[in-house]
Structures are given as structure tokens and as C-alpha cells.
Interface confidence: low
């Protein structure tokens, strides 16, 4: 008979014959022959293969490198890779999350518009007129100036984007 030119699903063509692929979690040791089936071996610890394959080497699990701010979110198995995520207080520097950096703080005069997440940095906004922030923080929003009037006081010193207003007593001498 003519040798096959294509093989069924989960098979591969070698030396004019169809051999079974190795299942996920196993690597190829030797191809099948006329007399023997494909020989496969389980991946070692810290290795994986996630598809039906004819790979002679398993892939190393991804290393969640603490120097890059990464930690293990989900431990890998013989069939799945390790999933990394950023340490708390850090966020990914790219969509692939191959490294992380510390959430930035908003400087005095700026408040937090959006608190950082594991995948996005802190978003800061300038404190508008009537609001201030006197701290460098990754959490604090701009605070409204104190309302002197509601306390029956007057403004003694105007507020800025970095300082609150200073209230003082009404001038008793005025009519």
C-alpha cells in the first residue's frame, strides 16, 4: 500500500508512517516503528507540555522572579505553565506581565484619580481650585478646602492645591 501523506488527529507522520503523539504532560522518547508504539515519558518536576506533542524536551515552568516584583499566582503542573502575578503594591509593566514596578504615589498638589491595580498604575490628577493634597500618597484623593463659613469663621489664609485654608474668628470690630 502507498505510505500515508496525512495522519489522523493526535498522530504525526514520520518515516512514512503515522505515530501517536504524546499526551499533554509527557514528552517524546522514541518514535513508533512497525513493531513498537510511540514511547513517551512524563515531564519532570518544574516542567510542562500543554498540548498533544512530539517534543523531546518539556518546557520549563515560568519563573516568577521576585527581582521583577513577581510572585506565583497559580503553580504549574505537568500540563500547565505557572501563572505569575505582581506582588501587592506593584503592577505589571506590560500586558504580558513579565515584570512589575511599584505603584507610584501622587505628589502634594495632586490626588489619586484611580487607585492602582495589579495591571494598572496609580492615576493622579491635579487638585482643582477648592481642593488640596498635602501628602505624597498612592491612595489619598484631593480633599476639599475647609468651609470657614459653616464654622462661623472667616478665611484668614487662602488655600492652595497643596494647603488647606486657614480659618479664624470674625473681626468683632466690624459692624
Amino acid at each position: 500500500p502507498e505510505p500515508p501523506t496525512a495522519c489522523r488527529e493526535k498522530q504525526y507522520l514520520i518515516n512514512s508512517q503515522c505515530c501517536s503523539l504524546c499526551q499533554p504532560g509527557q514528552k517524546l522518547v522514541s518514535d513508533c516503528t512497525e513493531f513498537t508504539e510511540t514511547e513517551c515519558l512524563p515531564c519532570g518536576e518544574s516542567e510542562f507540555l500543554d498540548t498533544w506533542n512530539r517534543e523531546t524536551h518539556c518546557h520549563q515552568h515560568k519563573y516568577c522572579d521576585p527581582n521583577l516584583g513577581l510572585r506565583v499566582q497559580q503553580k504549574g503542573t505537568s500540563e500547565t505553565d505557572t501563572i505569575c502575578t505582581c506582588e501587592e503594591g506593584w503592577h505589571c509593566t506590560s500586558e504580558a506581565c513579565e515584570s512589575c514596578v511599584l505603584h507610584r504615589s501622587c505628589s502634594p498638589g495632586f490626588g489619586v484619580k484611580q487607585i492602582a491595580t495589579g495591571v494598572s498604575d496609580t492615576i493622579c490628577e491635579p487638585c482643582p481650585v477648592g481642593f488640596f493634597s498635602n501628602v505624597s500618597s498612592a491612595f489619598e484623593k484631593c480633599h476639599p478646602w475647609t468651609s470657614c463659613e459653616t464654622k462661623d469663621l472667616v478665611v484668614q489664609q487662602a488655600g492652595t492645591n497643596k494647603t488647606d485654608v486657614v480659618c479664624g474668628p470674625q473681626d468683632r470690630l466690624r459692624a
Epitope: 522572579d65 521576585p66 506582588e87 503594591g89
Partner: antibody, heavy 119, light 112 residues
């Protein structure tokens, strides 16, 4: 003002042990920094020894430092310690405490503490 | 692990002039830009000047400029002043699963 200060250096005999302490002032470990130890032999370059993630306590060691050096932290005291054992003359150096907030860049350093290993 | 090779010491610079120090890595640094530069004066700890190859650290004068990518990096100091006399170190982070951190051997800058 953010500062780091090392202590615990001094003269120690070969095969001896020493524990160095780094005190952080002006910032909290809950701010999620890496705290590291770097050393510098007299007249030589810089060498990273070990780091600890101040928030979770996860550690990293240079391969040559594994086994003889142990890094740990105390969040309540805002300190990082480096325990050194089986010291040799080659460990004579100034030991610096340094902080990293990402990109493997050290933005804050202590003045250093000198460790001399000699008989 | 990567080996970082710096311009041999000492390098001479004239006040008001420009000086460049090179740093060559035996392997590409992480993301092609995870390289930093430090200034160290005798009896003092290193001071961060540049990180991510070209980003100026807080409080560092813009006379200091970092450039380069992959394996070749340069620190350039323009309008040199006497206070720039120091030893300069590059530091790179190469890759996971290795002793990825490496410091260069240092380059001494002498200001005349």
C-alpha cells in the same frame, strides 16, 4: 527624610558569624519595597548578596550566598537583618543596605558598615 | 550570568567639558533597558543617577544622560564640574533563573 542605617559590623575571626541590621527611617516596609544587601570589598566593585520583599517576606539570594547568608525582616521594627556564617577573609567588605522600588535600581542606600574577617 | 565591562579607569575630564563612560553587557539586559548607573565617592555609598538605561533619578542634574539598549550603554556627563569626580558603576539585570544581577567594575572619573 528617608534613610537607611546599617549596624553590626566589626572584626570577626575566620569561620565566625555576624549579624548585620539595617534600620529604615522615613518610610514603611508596608510600602512594598525590596530591601537588599550589597557588599564592596576594599578598593573593589559592588556585589549583590540578597534581597527580601519587605511586604511579603519573599527572598532572593545570589547563588554564591545561599547557605551561608540569611536575610530576614521585622516589619514592626522596620529592620532587615543579614546573618552571615562561616566567614572567610574574602568576606571582608563594607556591607550596604539598599532599597529597590523596581527596574532593579537601588534608589536609597545606607552609609555602610565595615566587616573585617581576620585572625 | 551577564558580565558588565566598563571603560577602563581612570577617565579624565576637563571642567566644563563632556565625558562619556561605556558599559558593555555580555548578554542583553532584561527588556533591553534594565540598566542603571551609580555615582560613588570615597567613603560614601553609591548614589542612583539613571535607571531604565535613560531615566534620570529624582534630584539628579540633567547634565547626566544615559543612553543605549540591549548590550551597549553609555553614561554622558556634560558641563563637567569638580563635584563630578567619582567612580561610576553600571548595574544590569539580565534574566530570570540566573544570577541576573551584575555590577560593572567601575570607572573613575578625574576632573582637571
Amino acid at each position: 527624610q528617608q534613610q537607611l542605617e546599617e549596624s553590626g559590623g566589626g572584626l570577626v575571626k575566620p569561620e565566625g558569624s555576624l549579624t548585620l541590621t539595617c534600620k529604615a527611617n522615613g518610610f514603611s516596609f508596608s510600602a512594598n519595597y525590596y530591601m537588599c544587601w550589597v557588599r564592596q570589598a576594599p578598593g573593589k566593585g559592588l556585589e549583590l548578596i540578597a534581597c527580601i520583599y519587605a511586604s511579603s517576606g519573599s527572598t532572593w539570594y545570589a547563588s554564591w550566598a545561599k547557605g551561608r547568608f540569611t536575610i530576614s525582616k521585622s516589619t514592626s521594627l522596620n529592620t532587615v537583618t543579614l546573618q552571615m556564617t562561616s566567614l572567610t577573609v574574602a568576606d571582608t567588605a563594607t556591607y550596604f543596605c539598599a532599597r529597590s522600588g523596581g527596574y532593579a535600581a537601588y534608589d536609597l542606600w545606607g552609609p555602610g558598615t565595615l566587616v573585617t574577617v581576620s585572625s | 550570568a551577564a558580565v558588565l565591562t566598563q571603560t577602563p579607569s581612570p577617565v579624565s575630564a576637563a571642567v566644563g567639558g563632556t565625558v562619556s563612560i561605556s558599559c558593555q553587557s555580555s548578554k542583553s539586559v532584561y527588556n533591553n533597558n534594565w540598566l542603571s548607573w551609580y555615582q560613588q565617592k570615597p567613603g560614601q555609598p553609591p548614589k542612583l543617577l539613571i535607571y531604565r538605561a535613560s531615566t534620570l533619578a529624582s534630584g539628579v542634574p540633567s547634565r547626566f544622560r544615559g543612553s543605549g539598549s540591549g548590550t551597549e550603554f553609555t553614561l554622558t556627563i556634560s558641563d563637567v564640574v569638580c563635584d563630578d569626580a567619582a567612580t561610576y558603576y553600571c548595574a544590569g539585570y539580565e534574566s530570570v533563573n540566573t544570577d541576573g544581577h551584575a555590577f560593572g567594575g567601575g570607572t573613575e572619573v578625574v576632573v582637571k
